[in-house]
């Protein structure tokens, strides 16, 4: 360092500012889910690469099935390593019924208030993992609509799992989950052969979320 | 604390009826499977068959159709295995467990996570 | 239906020794949906590893699942005093299930 370096007034890391998102992750946890550790082996691999912490990335976790569980909110943990434990005793709650749009009506309701720890001017991200098409899905291009009308980015996760041990065509359900996830619908939906295979868009899925950060 | 609790021996003659019963506690028992598992005297295990309690929807193993029927009532979170008319055949433990898995949508899949601690039942 | 058929039908070992269990499948079990449980006598079947490899929880890492397609494995590394009892194997790719005769582990 040369004699005259000085110190001038520092402008503070763009990293600082731009790691705060308010994730959310909706998991479907009806029954046909399985093995349910895969779901949670995924968490575990995306949330270890997040920077947690109430001045950081928030995360929260909604189930849902035929009703929903806000498993944590966003303001709950307050460092990754918290969010780690917790995301790993997540138990699959059962049912037979995915009710896709009340999961993702619910998080855009309530897990994203003020109250559950959403923060104000904080851009907010929603993380949909689900194996079927939804049961309410009359109601989806509302709820969809309503989480655009308050610029939620939806990333969609499409598990093929049970349509290919039924031997069942997907298409009509990769559709509807392409539907969920924002515009472009290329970078913002995903999908995996079965649950097993979660783990391998995890790399490619947080990087996109990441991105985020820097828009 | 997930635990299934089934109801007690019984000892029967050959033609009477018999209701058995095991009762769920610690999750959602309407939202899982439940499977019936026969084990004769010294044998090995055999399902039998399993049943939804949400909507009572039931599937039974080729071997059992027709000799049982197993129902459940979501109230009392309890699941059910009736015979019309015994056999001495009958004679084995009978357990009921809980699938972590699915049957709907064309298939059936996924393991046996919990376990009643069976009812023996006695038909001579 | 598939018939899962377990060798040998009786493992004679002393603690601290190696068990290893073989399930063979008549046909392919498709996503390597086997499970193993434990049965003592009395006693109602404990789960140990389904997904062929998985452990459930709560059970010990002397226990471990392996194999896929027809052929499965059930590896004990070193054989405790409470380990000595009948394991099952079970298939669930077939939509239905079916157990294996089962292979009984007693002491030397």
């Known amino acids: 360092v040369s004699p005259t370096f000085q110190v001038v007034n520092s402008i503070a890391p763009v990293q600082e500012c731009s790691t705060q998102l308010d994730i959310v992750i909706v998991l479907d946890g009806s029954n046909s889910i399985y093995p349910w550790d895969s779901v949670t082996a995924f968490l575990n691999d995306l949330l270890e690469r997040m920077d947690i912490g109430p001045k950081q990335t928030q995360v929260g976790i909604v189930q849902y099935g035929e009703n929903v569980t806000h498993e944590f909110n966003l303001n709950k943990y307050s460092s990754t390593e918290e969010v780690l434990v917790a995301a790993k005793k997540i138990v699959q709650r059962g049912g037979r019924q995915t009710m896709t749009a009340l999961g993702i009506d619910t998080a855009r309701k309530e897990a994203f208030t003020e109250a559950r720890g959403a923060r104000r001017g904080v851009k907010k991200v929603m993380v949909i993992v689900t194996d079927g098409e939804s049961h309410d899905n009359h109601r989806l291009k509302k709820v969809i609509q309503d989480c655009e009308d308050e610029n939620i980015q939806r990333f969609s996760i499409a598990i093929l799992g049970s349509y290919n041990r039924g031997n069942l065509s997907t298409e009509k359900f990769v559709e509807e989950i392409k539907s969920i996830a924002s515009e472009p619908t290329e970078k913002h939906f995903f999908n995996v052969s079965d649950e097993l295979a979660l783990v391998t868009i995890v790399k490619t899925l947080g990087e996109r979320i990441f991105a985020l950060e820097a828009t | 604390e997930v635990q299934l609790v089934q109801s007690g021996a019984e000892v029967k003659k050959p033609g009477e009826s018999l209701r058995i019963s095991c009762k769920g506690s610690?999750?959602?028992?309407?939202?899982?499977?439940i499977g019936w598992v026969r084990q004769m005297p010294g044998k090995g295990l055999e399902w039998m068959g399993i049943?939804?309690?949400?909507?009572?929807?039931?599937r039974y193993s080729p071997s059992f159709q027709g000799q049982v029927t197993i129902s459940a009532d979501k109230s009392i979170s309890t699941a059910f295995l009736q015979w019309i008319s015994l056999k001495a055949s009958d004679t084995a433990m009978y357990y009921c467990?809980?699938?972590?898995?699915?049957?709907?949508?064309?298939?059936?899949?996924?393991?046996?996570?919990?376990w009643g601690q069976g009812t023996l039942v006695t038909v001579s | 239906e598939i018939v899962l058929t377990q060798s040998p039908g009786t493992l004679s070992l002393s603690p601290g020794e190696r068990a290893t269990l073989s399930c063979r499948a008549s046909?392919?079990?498709?996503?390597?949906?086997l499970a193993w449980y434990q049965q003592k006598p009395a006693q109602a079947p404990r789960l140990l590893i389904y997904?062929?490899?998985r452990r459930a929880t709560g059970i010990p890492d002397r226990f471990s699942g392996s194999g896929s397609g027809t052929d499965f494995t059930l590896t004990i590394s070193r054989l405790e005093p409470e380990d000595f009892a009948v394991y099952y194997c079970?298939?669930?790719?077939?939509?239905?299930?079916?157990f294996g005769q089962g292979t009984t582990v007693e002491i030397k």
């Open positions: 997904v062929a490899s």
């Open positions: 467990a809980r699938l972590q898995g699915d049957c709907s949508g064309g298939s059936c899949y996924g393991h046996f996570d919990y």
């Open positions: 049943i939804y309690p949400g909507d009572s929807d039931t």
């Open positions: 046909q392919t079990i498709s996503s390597g949906y």
């Open positions: 079970q298939q669930y790719g077939s939509s239905s299930w079916t």
């Open positions: 610690g999750y959602s028992v309407s939202s899982y499977w």
